[in-house]
Interface confidence: medium
């Protein structure tokens, strides 16, 4: 079952699949000035059996100048269910998915291929996100998205990634800040120190946010 939509767009982030589930299709796109050979495949398909998966078909591009051809019009995103990914090396690889049964590795490049690969993902596909250079994540979290089938419809889960910080202001581009989980279940008890009538709970197991006020004469 193909996923209906693209993986979510995260500002200043790119995504990449570590491996591709069987059934995934990759469009045979050629760079400007080149086109698919007349008898060439429209797409590559990840297929396989229980022990081995591989890409069927091969993409081949030839120079458009060799013959007078009509320019192929690429459908707009709403007309064509596109799956886009860039060549991103992700540091977050909990599992080498390429070694998993039923998955294909990233297909090798072909001569004169387009700069951007367009994938058609299937249900169960997982993609990983990371911030582009010059941006960093607000905190660590599962920065992946999975295509799931719910009530007969496909949807991508939302990756927990927000990229922030411009290159000139980011001291350590791409650095992620560690995110600790609260110890136990926090209770949202707070107190305002201006009025001391509020009951306060202060325990190691509680996450509290206390607000107070300090005034100084303006000079």
């Amino acid at each position: 079952e193909l996923c209906d939509d693209d993986p979510p767009e995260i500002p200043h982030a790119t995504f990449k699949a570590m491996a591709y589930k069987e059934g995934t299709m990759l469009n045979c796109e050629c760079k400007r000035g080149f086109r698919r050979i007349k008898s060439g495949s429209l797409y590559m398909l990840c297929t396989g059996n229980s022990s081995h998966s591989s890409w069927d078909n091969q993409c081949q591009c030839t120079s458009s100048a060799t013959r007078n051809t009509t320019k192929q019009v690429t459908p707009q995103p709403e007309e064509q269910k596109e799956r886009k990914t860039t060549e991103m090396q992700s540091p977050m690889q909990p599992v080498d998915q390429a070694s998993l049964p039923g998955h294909c590795r990233e297909p090798p490049p072909w001569e004169n291929e387009a700069t951007e690969r367009i994938y058609h993902f299937v249900v169960g596909q997982m993609v990983y996100y990371q911030c582009v250079q010059g941006y960093r994540a607000l905190h660590r979290g599962p920065a992946e998205s999975v295509c799931k089938m719910t009530h007969g419809k496909t949807r991508w889960t939302q990756p927990q990634l927000i990229c922030t910080g411009e290159m000139e202001t980011s001291q350590f581009p791409g650095e992620e800040k560690p995110q600790a989980s609260p110890e136990g279940r926090p209770e949202s008890e707070t107190s305002c120190l201006v009025t001391t009538t509020d009951f306060q709970i202060q325990t190691e197991m509680a996450a509290t946010m206390e607000t107070s006020i300090f005034t100084t004469e303006y000079q």
Partner: antibody, heavy 104, light 105 residues
């Protein structure tokens, strides 16, 4: 014209490793985002509307974040909340708020 | 980025209340919902689409489709009367909806 510094103390979790945000709510109005700070290294991000109007700071040694004005105006009268940016980027725990009233 | 909510929604006790929040590409972003009762701090009721924090009743649910996020309260109770705010992120900036006052008739 007076200066003012309000504080927000967190406890019961690793204060240094969660962002703290500040939110303004003027009387009878909605929530307005002011900015946030990462106490671990004092990395600070301001909403464009509040850039230059307030200063956000933190002292991780005492698990406290601050919101400061150098010169208050009557239009600064509002309730100010601090909130923790929790797992999944929700504002999961909020302070009770500090009511700031500026009058001449 | 602007999030648009209806200023008010009315519902009878026991009925289902739906509060919408619309904004550009909201369906591709995080969507959160907060409840604020008079004189109290906001409380997170829906985290990331449809996840309810501990302690939030099951009658609160969320959905996110296209450019609209929806908070649904089934079997609305009088105690649910409050202001509700949607929220998302735009880069490192939090964006709130204008708020919806839920009245339980």
């Amino acid at each position: 014209g007076e200066s003012l510094k309000i504080s927000c103390k967190g406890s019961g979790y690793s204060f240094s490793t969660y962002w703290i945000g500040w939110v303004r709510q003027m009387p009878g109005k909605g929530l307005e985002w002011m900015g946030l700070i990462y106490p671990g290294d004092s990395d600070t991000r301001y909403s464009p509307s509040f850039q230059g109007q307030v200063t956000i700071s933190a002292d991780k040694s005492i698990s406290t974040a601050y919101l400061q004005w150098s010169s208050l105006k009557a239009s600064d009268t509002a309730m100010y909340y601090c909130a923790r940016v929790g797992d999944g980027y929700s504002l999961d725990y909020w302070g009770q708020g500090t009511l700031v009233t500026v009058s001449s | 980025s602007v999030l648009t909510q209806p200023p008010s929604v009315s519902v009878s006790p026991g009925q289902t209340a739906s509060i919408t929040c619309s904004g550009h590409k909201l369906g591709e972003r995080f969507a959160y919902w907060y409840q604020q009762k008079p004189g109290q701090s906001p409380v997170l009721v829906i985290n990331q689409y449809i996840r309810r924090p501990s302690g939030i009743p099951e009658r609160f649910s969320g959905s996110n489709s296209g450019s609209t996020a929806t908070l649904t309260i089934s079997g609305t109770q009088a105690m649910d009367e409050a202001d509700y705010y949607c929220q998302t992120w735009d880069g490192s900036i939090v964006v709130f909806g204008g708020g919806t006052k839920l009245t339980v008739l």
